[in-house]
């Protein structure tokens, strides 16, 4: 898998999207995990609703939310109030039994808030994207869903 880079500004929200083949992953729950080291395990952060038909409902774990458009085939993860320690490698996963298939590898980069004049010494500034093979950068601007904007759940 290539790594897709998503950049967000410290203190703001970052929305990460993971497209997938909706037929191939039909009926499967999804998850967002953080890669621990290059070869280490991927530690689960948040997963979609236990009932697949309710995957469109947003689930939170701390400041991270997940929602799945199972018909359109897009998993969306929101990282609220982005912090420097949120930077790193993640995966979007499709779950089956105790196993998981990687839908997308994601590098989250946290940029300093240009309006924040405090000491930014503890901010992590990412290196060159080229260090990731065929890395693709997406500048993500997120917004909250409006009331009544939740997609209608699929019927099967």
């Amino acid at each position: 898998h290539n790594t897709t880079v998503f950049q967000g500004v410290a203190g703001q929200s970052l929305q990460v999207s993971c497209p997938y083949d909706s037929m191939k992953h039909w009926g499967r729950r999804k998850a967002w995990c953080r890669q621990l080291g290059e070869k280490g395990p991927c530690q689960r952060v948040v997963s979609t609703h236990n009932l697949w038909l309710l995957s469109f409902l947003r689930r939170w774990n701390g400041s991270t939310a997940i929602t799945d458009d199972t018909l359109g085939g897009t998993l969306t993860i929101t990282l609220r109030n982005l912090q420097p320690h949120d930077a790193g490698l993640y995966q979007c996963q499709s779950l089956h039994g105790s196993e998981a298939d990687t839908l997308r590898k994601v590098l989250v980069e946290v940029l300093a808030d240009p309006l924040d004049h405090r000491d930014a010494g503890d901010l992590w500034f990412p290196g060159e994207s080229e260090s990731f093979e065929d890395a693709h950068v997406e500048h993500s601007i997120s917004r909250s869903l409006l009331e009544g904007e939740i997609p209608f759940p699929p019927t099967s």
Epitope: K24, G27, R28, G97
Partner: antibody, heavy 118, light 107 residues
């Protein structure tokens, strides 16, 4: 209608390699995972491995890591399995089977009989 | 690897009998277990998905139950066409593993 058409019976000599094919019609293999399973004469079913045709990612059973190589050609909607360093106990029927969504092995190929003999 | 212990390995019953086949799994697989029927010279045919969900087109005399480590396939009233070999499969974790099979015949 989804159909999996496997290549014909193979007679292989010990130490050589053969390549089996499984052509899918009625479904885009990019939207599936393709598995291979074998069955030795009069025995049970044994899982060999699985390929994701969309990206080539594979998972193998420990026993088949140095025996089977799974590939797929999405342009022809065909999956392949190469068996190397053939031995007499590789004699078996080899099946391909589809996984997608929550459907596990709903669709199977008819099987290819591989006989290894000098 | 997850070990699958299927019993009995051979079963002889009369038409109309209630038949049960068991599959014991060496570790918890939740409900990630399927049952297949195989006739001689043919590929397996799916009967039961996720422990108890009847595959479309399969007669209702077939049913599955269990979760975790103990699973059962039941044929409520055995028919002549049910003569076959039956396998369980766990798809909870790699490598996938099959039961050794139960050969069913009519008395």
């Amino acid at each position: 209608e989804v159909q999996l058409q496997q290549s014909g019976a193979e007679l292989g000599k010990p130490g050589t390699s053969i390549k089996l094919s499984c052509k899918v019609s009625g479904f885009n293999i990019r939207s599936t995972f393709m598995h291979w399973v074998n069955q030795r004469p009069g025995k049970g079913l044994e899982w060999i491995g699985r390929i994701d045709p969309a990206n080539g990612n594979t998972v193998y059973g420990e026993k088949f890591k140095n025996k089977a190589t799974l590939t797929a050609d999405t342009s022809s909607n065909t999956a392949y399995m190469q068996l190397s360093q053939l031995k007499s106990d590789d004699t078996a029927i080899y099946f391909c089977a589809l996984e997608f969504g929550v459907s596990w092995f709903e669709y199977w190929g008819q099987g290819t009989l591989v006989t290894v003999s000098s | 690897d997850i070990q699958m212990t299927q019993s009995p390995s051979f079963l002889s019953a009369s038409v109309g009998d209630r038949v049960t086949i068991n599959c014991k799994v060496s570790q918890n697989v939740d409900r990630n277990l399927n049952w297949y029927q195989q006739n001689l010279g043919e590929p397996p045919k799916p009967l039961i998905n996720f422990a108890n969900s009847l595959q479309t087109g399969v007669p209702s005399r077939f049913s599955g139950s269990g979760s975790g480590t103990d699973f059962t396939l039941t044929i409520s009233s055995l028919q002549p066409e049910d003569v076959a070999t039956y396998f369980c499969l766990q798809h909870n974790s790699w490598p996938l593993t099959f039961g050794s099979g139960t050969k069913l015949e009519i008395k």
